[in-house]
């Protein structure tokens, strides 16, 4: 069977007025999954992202994360969409250096 | 001008099926997630679940996960909510909803789905 | 899931009137929180997105103000097109989730 996402979002300073947002999928099984940035409800184009490869994390699952840098203060306007297994979530940036998890069940 | 049209009420009998449409028009139905919301008479809103019309993956409030059905057809436009096993409690307004980013920017006009006997 | 309570669920007011509505969430909801106004027999209108954004075409004696768990709709010089019913919602996990309402009317 599949195991669906651990999805956790993340904030840093990037440079003056940026911040970097990332996301993080983890503990998912099969490894096909889509994770990616959407402002405004849209997909963010691919050169916008970095994107990190699909690993094992060492328990039969996989991890895999996307990031984006934005201007600060515009944090509320991007949602990280996660994709796996027919099943999708959104995820939106948190207030603060705070980080947050989310599970998404199938 | 963002629209969403849905079907007509509907009237149906505990135990059956009841499918509601929405058609988009005025913007990229494949670029956003279309939620669904309930509204009990005199009550209070309720998210159903969603779906990415793109690819056809969906959301489901783990409420209705057993009996609900949310799926897209992009050739015309038109997001689905199939509610099986219906029960008087079911009685309500049905809304499709634009999931802009982070909130609702648009909503159809609603369809009322009565279970009766 | 996170629990959305309204408060008051009914108020009566004059026109004219400075109205404010709260709404409190069971856990940080982060500003992810929006207001909608619904009249019998309609579908929810948006009036503020992100806590304190007003929406396009919505008149400024709406505002919205808050963070964390505590946020407010007030509006600043009620209007007789302003008797409605007023929910919040969070967006800031799925189940997405709504407030009770407060239903606004005529003193």
């Known amino acids: 069977g599949s195991v669906p996402p651990m999805v956790n979002v993340t904030r840093s300073e990037a440079s003056e007025g940026n911040i970097t947002v990332t996301c993080r999928a983890s503990s998912f099984y099969p490894r096909n999954i889509t994770l990616t940035w959407r402002q405004d409800g849209v997909s963010l184009s691919h050169d916008t992202q970095q994107w990190g490869d699909v690993l094992p994390d060492g328990n039969g699952t996989y991890q895999t994360w996307v990031a984006t840098r934005i201007c600060q203060g515009e944090e509320q306007r991007f949602t990280c969409y996660m994709e796996h297994s027919g099943n999708h979530s959104t995820h939106p940036v948190p207030s603060g250096n705070s980080h947050h998890h989310h599970h998404h069940h199938h | 001008e963002v629209q969403l049209v849905q079907s007509g009420a509907e009237v149906k009998k505990p135990g059956a099926s009841v499918k509601v449409s929405c058609k988009a028009s005025g913007y990229a139905f494949t670029n956003y997630l279309i939620e669904w919301v309930r509204q009990a008479p005199g009550q209070g809103l309720e998210w159903i679940g969603a779906?990415?019309?793109?690819?056809?993956?969906?959301n489901y409030n783990e409420k209705f996960k057993d009996r609900v059905t949310i799926t897209a057809d992009t050739s015309t436009s038109t997001a689905y909510l199939e509610l099986s096993s219906l029960r008087s409690e079911d009685t309500a307004v049905y809304y499709c909803?634009?999931?802009?980013?982070?909130?609702?920017?648009?909503w159809g006009q609603g369809t009322l789905v009565t279970v009766s006997s | 899931d996170i629990q959305m309570t309204q408060s008051p669920s009914s108020l009566s007011a004059s026109v004219g009137d400075r109205v404010t509505i709260t709404c409190r969430a069971s856990?940080?909801?982060?500003?992810?929180l929006a207001w909608y106004q619904q009249k019998p027999g309609k579908s929810p209108k948006l009036l503020v997105y992100?806590?304190?954004t007003l929406a396009d075409g919505v008149p400024s004696r709406f505002s919205g103000s808050g963070s964390g768990t505590d946020y407010t709709l007030t509006i600043s010089s009620l209007q007789p097109e302003d008797f409605a019913t007023y929910f919040c919602q969070q967006f800031w996990t799925t189940p997405y989730t709504f407030g009770q309402g407060t239903k606004v009317e005529i003193k």
């Open positions: 856990g940080n909801i982060h500003s992810y």
């Open positions: 992100y806590a304190e």
């Open positions: 909803a634009r999931f802009l980013g982070n909130y609702f920017d648009n």
């Open positions: 779906i990415n019309p793109g690819s056809g993956a969906t």
